[in-house]
Amino acid sequence: EVEKTACPSGKKAREIDESLIFYKKWELEACVDAALLATQMDRVNAIPFTYEQLDVLKHKLDELYPQGYPESVIQHLGYLFLKMSPEDIRKWNVTSLETLKALLEVNKGHEMSPQVATLIDRFVKGRGQLDKDTLDTLTAFYPGYLCSLSPEELSSVPPSSIWAVRPQDLDTCDPRQLDVLYPKARLAFQNMNGSEYFVKIQSFLGGAPTEDLKALSQQNVSMDLATFMKLRTDAVLPLTVAEVQKLLGPHVEGLKAEERHRPVRDWILRQRQDDLDTLGLGLQGGIPNGYLVLDLSMQEALS
C-alpha cells in the first residue's frame, strides 16, 4: 500500500469547514495546515468532528505550539478542550476571564474534571488571588468550588470576594475551611445592620468563635437549628443557657430533638441541670446541683 503522507490533489484545506468531517485521519494530517487551524479555531466548535479527528487536530496544534497554546487559540478551543490533558494545560498562560468562561462552558453540567481543576489553578495562580469576578464565575459553574480549596488556598481570597458567595457554595465546607472564611466574611459585612448582617454571615458561622456567638445572642437573631448544629463545638461549649436561649429565640425548642447530637450533646454536659430545666424542654444530662465544676483548661493555662 502507498504510504499516505502527501495530501491528495484538490484536497488541501483552504478553510476549516464542514467538508473536513469527510476526511480520513491521514488526510486531515496531510491536508490541514496547522497555522490555518490556529487562526480558524472558532469554527472547529461548529463542526461535528469525531473524537479520532479531534485527536489529529490537537496533534497539529501541539506541533505548532510545543511550549503551549497562545490564549487566542485557547479561547476558541471549544470541545477540543476535552481532549487536553492536565499536562497540556500546565503549559498555558490563561489571563482572560472570558477564556476561562468559554472553557468552563464546554464542561458545563459535568463534574469538575482534572483538566478543569488544572485550568482553574493556572488561572487563579496567574491572577495572584481569587478576585470577586473569578469567584462569581467559578461558583456559578461549580457551586462546591470554594469548599474544594485547602485552607491555605482560601487564605488568598480577599474579603471583597465574599460578596459573591451563596449559601449553597458552602454546603460541603468543613470547619477548617470555615475558620478561614469566617473572618473574611465578618470583615466584608461589617458595615451592615443587625438583621441584614446575620442573613449574610449565617452561612459562615461554622467558623465563628465564642465571643462572636455571644455578641449575636444579644441581637435577637433567632438562629435556626440547622445553623446551630454546624457551629464549632468548642465555640458553643462556653455559652450559657441564657445565651443559647437568646441566640435561638423561638427555635430553642429544637434542642430537644438534637440532644444526642454534637454540639448540643456536649453543650448539655457542660450546663447546670438547674439552668437547663429553666428551658422547660426536658433536657437531661446536665451537671447535678451541688457539684463543683473545675475548668481544667483554664487551670493548665495559669500554671
Epitope: D17, E18, S19, R43, V44, N45, A46, I47, P48, G78
Partner: nanobody, 117 residues
Framework: QVQLGESGGGLVQAGGSLRLSCAAS????????MIWHRQAPGKQREPVAS???????NYGDSVKGRFTVSRDIVKNTMYLQMNSLKPEDTAVYYC???????????WGQGTQVTVSS
C-alpha cells in the same frame, strides 16, 4: 438556539428510494452548514452528506452517486434523496446544523431508515 426536526424515514425494499427532510427553526445565520449523519446499530456515527449556505456539497464515499443532498434556503430545510438503497444503509439518520458565526452545532433527534433485502 436552533431546533432541528428530521422526517421521511421508514421501511423500504433494497433498490428502493426515500427522501429525508430536516427542517431548521430558530436563529438561522450565515455562514452555516447542514449535515446528514447516520449511525447503524453497534457502529460509529458517520457523515453521509453536507451542504453549506453557499450551496457547496460533500458526500461520504459509501453514498456517492446514490444519494443527493439539497437545501431550500427559504424554508430552512435540507433534503436527502436516497436512491438504490442497500441493506447496509439501514441506520438512524440524524441532521446537524453548524453555526459558524457563533461556533456552535445543533442536532436533531434522528429518523429510522430500514432497508430490507
Amino acid at each position: 438556539q436552533v431546533q432541528l426536526g428530521e422526517s421521511g424515514g421508514g421501511l423500504v425494499q433494497a433498490g428502493g428510494s426515500l427522501r429525508l427532510s430536516c427542517a431548521a427553526s430558530g436563529s438561522i445565520f450565515s455562514p452555516n452548514a447542514m449535515i446528514w449523519h447516520r449511525q447503524a446499530p453497534g457502529k460509529q456515527r458517520e457523515p453521509v452528506a453536507s451542504i453549506n449556505s453557499s450551496g457547496s456539497t460533500n458526500y461520504g464515499d459509501s453514498v456517492k452517486g446514490r444519494f443527493t443532498v439539497s437545501r431550500d434556503i427559504v424554508k430552512n430545510t435540507m433534503y436527502l434523496q436516497m436512491n438504490s438503497l442497500k441493506p447496509e444503509d439501514t441506520a438512524v439518520y440524524y441532521c446537524s446544523y453548524s453555526d459558524f458565526r457563533r461556533g456552535t452545532q445543533y442536532w436533531g433527534q434522528g429518523t429510522q431508515v430500514t432497508v430490507s433485502s
